[in-house]
């Protein structure tokens, strides 16, 4: 004759307030004859949760039909879970006896605990922009989860980061917990289109972690490089000078030309293009009139990027005698 085993497969059952919890219990033998009851807790103070034969248990239903002669499944469902329902639940086999049934064997128990999903992680970046090669900090916060065990990972694009610190509060027992993590990220010049991702894994999420993201475009300032060149071709009595402002971000940029220290008010042609990495290029053309009185012309292209200190590049104009001689020529 096979010895009776009481199988409660889940050691821990996480449930959410208001939902229905299923407590599993199966037996391996129909003998000895007698009922299976459910209790919360152990010892003389244990609370009867379900007895098929007697009592009123409005929130409890059975998974299987217990009236069937060969039934071996004594699982129950408890509806409308509240915080008061937490505890360890035991299914207990009784042997039929007289005048009363005698406890024969107990299952190992299933601990019912309230599980609460973490809120969607919120990632916040630095208040001010920083240039490449510097380190910036991002924080990630998620709240309201239970139990306390939680895993948090940081990624920059697809690559996991290791430089971060995480705290879960409170340290003691609580209905719900919060997590806060701060990651340090080194900015690369091509990070305009990059993201930092905070990933939170918790038992209530069934293996589908929550993610919060922040765009590094909000945190990075890529300073421009400047180049001023004189075009070899002359347009009538004018020389074309180009100021190329390359690889900057964000787009906010002010460009001014000055001739021998005097700021030029006249309009110049310009184009703005976006690079593949999200940075910008700005090209400005400046036409300088050539005349005999203009021997030493120094042109300065000055750029103020994103409220930073202005940077400038100078060019001493090379006007050959031949060009001066031709400067009065009519242009077609």
């Amino acid at each position: 004759e096979e010895e009776l085993q009481m199988i409660q497969p889940e050691k821990l059952l996480l449930v959410t307030v208001g939902k229905t919890a299923t407590l599993h219990c199966t037996v391996t033998s129909l003998l000895p004859v007698g009922p299976v009851l459910w209790f919360r807790g152990v010892g003389p103070g244990r609370e009867l949760i379900y007895n098929q034969k007697e009592g009123h248990f409005p929130r409890v239903t059975t998974v299987s039909d217990l009236t069937k002669r060969n039934n071996m499944d004594f699982s129950i469902r408890i509806s409308s879970i509240t915080p008061a329902d937490v505890g360890t639940y035991y299914c207990v086999k009784f042997r039929k006896g007289s005048p009363e049934n005698v406890e024969f064997k107990s299952g190992p128990g299933t601990e019912m605990a309230l599980g609460a999903k973490p809120s969607a992680p919120v990632v916040l970046g630095p208040a001010a922009r920083t240039t490449p090669e510097h380190t910036v900090s991002f924080t990630c916060e998620s709240h309201g989860f239970s139990p306390r065990d939680i895993t948090l990972k940081w990624f920059k694009n697809g690559n996991e980061l290791s430089d971060f610190q995480t705290n879960v509060d409170p340290t003691g027992q609580s209905v719900a917990y919060s997590i806060r993590s701060t990651a340090r990220v080194v900015l690369d010049p091509w990070d305009v289109r990059s993201q930092v991702i905070c990933e939170v894994a918790h038992v209530t999420l069934q293996g589908d972690p929550l993610r919060g993201t922040a765009n590094l475009s909000e945190a990075i300032r890529v300073p421009p490089t400047l180049e001023v060149t004189q075009q070899p071709m002359r347009v009538g009595n004018q020389v074309n000078v180009t100021c190329q402002v390359r690889k900057f971000y964000p787009q906010s940029l002010q460009l001014t030309w000055s001739e021998n220290g005097n700021v030029c008010q006249r309009e110049t042609a310009s184009t703005l293009t976006e690079n593949k990495d999200g940075t910008y290029n700005w090209t400005s053309w400046f036409l300088v009139n050539i005349s005999d009185q203009r021997d030493d012309v120094v042109l300065t292209c000055q750029v103020k990027h994103d409220g930073q200190l202005a940077v400038s590049k100078r060019l001493a104009l090379e006007v050959t005698v031949h060009q001066k001689d031709q400067s009065s020529d009519a242009t077609p």
Partner: antibody, heavy 126, light 107 residues
Framework: QVQLVQSGAEVKKPGASVKVSCKAS????????INWVRQAPGQGLEWMGW????????GYAQKLQGRVTMTRDTSTSTVYMELSSLRSEDTAVYYC???????????????????WGQGTLVTVSS | DIQMTQSPSSLSASVGDRVTITCRAS??????LGWYQQKPGKAPKLLIY???NLQSGVPSRFSGSGSGTDFTLTISSLQPEDFATYYC?????????FGGGTKVEIK
């Protein structure tokens, strides 16, 4: 499935221009950059440049600057590559190729080319 | 421009052989490297991206390794359909450049 279908073979005289088309299907046209690569007979692969079909931004190989122009027509999901002032050394098979989407890992922000057109043979001969 | 040097330029091998092709960059390119297979009259096909990641649909006998300047493409057990020309390509800097190619022929 992703497909890039190019226009047919062309024979051109030196000094002329050629315009090769590349029609994309099976994916969101504006999400992926298109690159052009050419291959002279019996030779290796030479990159010509890229185009962003969403913004119209382009980047060309220095060697071809001033001779190559890439344009697009978003209504037909087609990218065009025009090469002017043709010379005999431009004789090659011209491929359009979709650039694999991904984060930038360098300032070029280029990525490998995951889908290619069937190629268009352009012959430059007097 | 970044020069990509492939070796050998050609090799003869038999079905079932383990084949290794190397590619060297003239400067550090991190892991911004792809490997392509090209058969006569056909367009190149991407096999490996980011030096070691297998492109979707590519058999697992192809693998890539390396970082910085030295990279390797390995075919663990050569199959009849693998006889082709293989190119490496850097995507670290403009212009994107390819190696000269390695022709894998039947021994």
């Amino acid at each position: 499935q992703v497909q890039l279908v190019q226009s047919g073979a062309e024979v051109k005289k030196p000094g002329a221009s050629v315009k090769v088309s590349c029609k994309a299907s099976g994916y969101t046209f504006t999400r992926y950059d298109i690159n052009w690569v050419r291959q002279a007979p019996g030779q290796g692969l030479e990159w010509m440049g890229w185009m962003n079909p969403n913004s119209g931004n382009t980047g060309y190989a220095q060697k071809l600057q001033g001779r190559v122009t890439m344009t697009r027509d978003t209504s037909t999901s087609t990218v065009y590559m025009e090469l002017s002032s043709l010379r005999s050394e431009d004789t090659a098979v011209y491929y359009c190729a979709r650039e694999r989407v991904g984060y930038c890992s360098s300032t070029s922000c280029l990525h490998p080319l995951d889908y290619w057109g069937q190629g268009t043979l352009v012959t430059v001969s007097s | 421009d970044i020069q990509m040097t492939q070796s050998p330029s050609s090799l003869s091998a038999s079905v079932g052989d383990r084949v290794t092709i190397t590619c060297r960059a003239s400067q550090g390119i991190r892991n911004d490297l792809g490997w392509y297979q090209q058969k006569p009259g056909k367009a190149p096909k991407l096999l490996i991206y980011s030096a070691s990641n297998l492109q979707s649909g590519v058999p697992s006998r192809f693998s890539g390794s390396g970082s910085g300047t030295d990279f390797t493409l390995t075919i663990s057990s050569l199959q009849p359909e693998d006889f082709a020309t293989y190119y490496c390509q850097q995507s670290y800097d403009v212009p994107l450049t390819f190696g000269g190619g390695t022709k894998v022929e039947i021994k």
